[in-house]
Structures are given as C-alpha cells and as structure tokens.
C-alpha cells in the first residue's frame, strides 16, 4: 500500500517517500523505486537553509555599500548573507535592504537608547529636574545644577531645555 505520509526529512511524490535534499543542496531529480533522490550543491554565492526539494538555490543578499550597507555575516551554502548598516546609519526594515542616518533627539529630549546598525535612536522627554539644550544622537537628559551644594540659590528656574541659573544668596543686613 502506498504511503500517505512520510518521515521527517522526506517528501511524498508519485506515491513514494523520497529523501529531501540537505541544506546547501538543491533537488536535481526525485527518487524512484530504484534510485535515491539526486541533489546538487548550491553554486558559490547561493544558498538553501532548510531540508528541501527546491530545484533552484536562492541568491545571497548583496550588502551594497552605496546604500550604506555592510556585511555582518558572510553567506554560505546553508545561510544567507546578513547585512547591517555602516556607523551612523540604521536599517530601514527588518530585512535591512537600505540604511538611513540615525535621528537626533531635539532640545528638551534626551537619548533613551543609542541607535545601532539595526535600530534608530530612541528619545525621551526630559523629566522635571533634567534638561537637554542640544540636538544629539548620544546625549542623555542632564540633571539641573544643584545650587545648594555650591552655597548658591536658584536665580532662574530650569526647564526641560535649560539648566537652572544659580546666583549668590541675598545677604540680609
């Protein structure tokens, strides 16, 4: 009786279970009653990353330097090339097909998480007691100066964009 299901790493064809091709190899011909599945290695710069019955290998991704891309992991017969972005840039999508510059956090906002090759800068508003007076992709919100520790008093209140201004204490006669 012909099988209706096959074991792992096999596939059903012509009422017969044939072995799948291993990663890094493509299918040339299905097995028969008398012959094994015929597989062939993928060509250089091509890959297949699963046990398969594909007749064509996939092309390695190209990390195009003109798009700001660079290689993170070289492709092999079993794995695709993994791209990332050059310094100062990050991927526009999960598949990392192009790169854009990291955004800066505007005054009043600080960097919560510095950008990487695959993620943009994450900014956060400076809470009370903190400020940022620059547009930066690296600087966190900084705490207001503590006038008291310098034996000074607050002459001008701080904001999320400006530090407090300290001044001498008024001497009472």
């Amino acid at each position: 009786e012909p099988p209706t299901a096959c074991r792992e790493k096999q596939y059903l064809i012509n009422s017969q279970c044939c072995s799948l091709c291993q990663p890094g190899q493509k299918l040339v011909s299905d097995c028969t009653e008398f012959t094994e599945t015929e597989c062939l290695p993928c060509s250089e710069s091509e890959f297949l990353d699963t046990w398969n019955r594909e007749t064509r290998c996939h092309q390695h991704k190209y990390c195009d330097p003109n798009l700001g891309l660079q290689v993170q992991q070289k492709g092999t017969s079993e794995t695709d090339t993994i791209c990332t972005c050059e310094e100062g840039l990050h991927c526009t999508s999960e598949s990392c097909e192009s790169c854009v510059p990291h955004r800066s956090c505007l005054p009043g906002f600080g960097v919560k998480q510095i950008a990487t090759g695959v993620s943009d800068t994450i900014c956060e508003p400076c809470p009370v007691g903190f400020f940022s007076n620059v547009s930066s992709a690296f600087e966190k919100c900084r705490p207001w100066t503590s006038c008291e520790t310098k034996d000074l008093v607050v002459q001008q209140a701080g904001t999320n964009k400006t530090d407090v201004v300290c001044g001498p204490q008024d001497r009472q006669r």
Epitope: P41, G75, D80
Partner: antibody, heavy 119, light 113 residues
Framework: EVQLVESGGGLVKPGGSLRLSCAAS????????MHWVRQAPGKGLEWVAY????????YYADTVKGRFTISRDNAKNSLYLQMNSLRAEDTALYYC????????????WAQGTLVTVSS | DIVMTQSPDSLAVSLGERATMSCKSS????????????LTWHQQKPGQPPKLLIY???TRESGVPDRFSGSGSGTDFTLTISSLQAEDVAVYYC?????????FGGGTKVEIK
C-alpha cells in the same frame, strides 16, 4: 590540475595605474568566487577584494575602496584588478585566490605578482 | 572590522615534538545559521603562496596530514601540529572567514629547534 597564474605586476610611480590579471585553468572558473589578497614585503596577508562567481557581488577593503576595481570575464577564465591612484603603501605581492561554494574559504592561491610603487 | 591576534609570533620546536599556536578574534566567528565557526588556517612556506590547511575551525583540507588539527569556538582558536616534521617549517596564518572585510592574524612562524 587547478592553476592560477597572475601577470601585470611591475614598477609604477605614485599616482600611477596598473592592471593585474589572473588566468585560471583546471576548473570551471564561472563556479567560483575570486579574491585578491596582498602581502607587503616581509609582512602578513591583507585581503583586498572579492567578486562572486556571477559578477553580482563585489566587496573591497577600505584601504583600496574607490581606487581599485575587481572584475572578471568568465568567458576568458580571467580575473582582473585595476589599480589607480597607487601609493607607496600599495607595494606588495598580489595573490589571486579562489573561493568555492562549499567551504567558503580560499582553497587555491596563485604564486603572486609583485607591484612596486616608487618614484 | 574583526581583529585577529595570533600568539606567539614565533615558535621553535624540536622535530617530533608538539607545536601549538593560538588565534583570538575580536568578535565571535560563529555563524548563527549553521553553527559553524568560520575560522580558517593557512600555511605559507618560505618563497611560496599560502595554502589552505584547515577550514571551519577543525576540518582539514584534502591532503593535509592528520598531525595538523584545529580546535576552538567563538573567539578562541588553536592550531596544533602533533609531531613536527621538517616540511612544517612555515608561517601559519589564521583568518576570519565569517565576515567582510576578511582579516588575517599576524602569523606564527614555526621553526625547528
């Protein structure tokens, strides 16, 4: 028998140009990626450039980017390295080497051709 | 770029004795997809081009004597010659085959004591 034979090396002045060739035989050239690697006199190995089997993928070392161009002609079983704006620090023995689609390593190296950049 | 650091710079070993050299990479050479470490060793004899010795950290190239063995994973790798022969006098280079730019260690020169 796998053979890789380079030519085109020689003495050139700073700012000058040179084109290296690597003739391949004994294997199906169009099935292999190819690299150029150089070795300054008495020094270690430095990777220069790579081109995939079908010409689709090309990578360069930062030290040569914008000055060197790797190319190949599969019909002629030949690999090339066009070197422009040459500098004294480009003086080296230049090797072509092939990369197969299994190991993804440089499995055969040519004998090398010497490039000397000097005024 | 991945920096490859080899030690020692040179090694003098008696014939028939063991020679061991180290290679460290500044980041992991483990391919996450197939779990292979893409660390390659090349041998360069005086006046000759380099020759592929070992790939994937520990797989000997066809024709390479079994006295040569490679080991390690991630960032720490070792090449061992179990019983040094006169024809093993050479410089041995480890190479990052994991990512571009491909980078080489500075080499370990093996001599006979």
């Amino acid at each position: 028998e796998v053979q890789l034979v380079e030519s085109g090396g020689g003495l050139v002045k700073p700012g000058g140009s040179l084109r290296l060739s690597c003739a391949a035989s004994g294997f199906t050239f169009s099935d292999y990626g190819m690299h150029w690697v150089r070795q300054a006199p008495g020094k270690g190995l430095e990777w220069v450039a790579y081109i995939s089997s079908g010409n689709r993928i090309i990578y360069y070392a930062d030290t040569v980017k914008g000055r060197f161009t790797i190319s190949r002609d599969n019909a002629k079983n030949s690999l090339y390295l066009q070197m422009n704006s040459l500098r004294a620090e480009d003086t080296a023995l230049y090797y072509c080497a092939r990369q197969d689609g299994y190991r993804y390593a440089m499995d055969y190296w040519a004998q090398g051709t010497l490039v000397t950049v000097s005024s | 770029d991945i920096v490859m650091t080899q030690s020692p710079d040179s090694l003098a070993v008696s014939l028939g004795e063991r020679a061991t050299m180290s290679c460290k990479s500044s980041q992991s050479l483990l391919n996450s997809g197939n779990q292979k470490n893409y660390l390659t060793w090349h041998q360069q004899k005086p006046g000759q081009p380099p020759k592929l010795l070992i790939y994937w950290t520990s797989t000997r190239e066809s024709g390479v004597p079994d006295r040569f063995s490679g080991s390690g994973s991630g960032t720490d790798f070792t090449l061992t010659i179990s019983s040094l022969q006169a024809e093993d006098v050479a410089v041995y280079y480890c190479q990052n085959d994991y990512t571009y730019p491909l980078t080489f260690g500075g080499g370990t020169k093996v001599e006979i004591k």
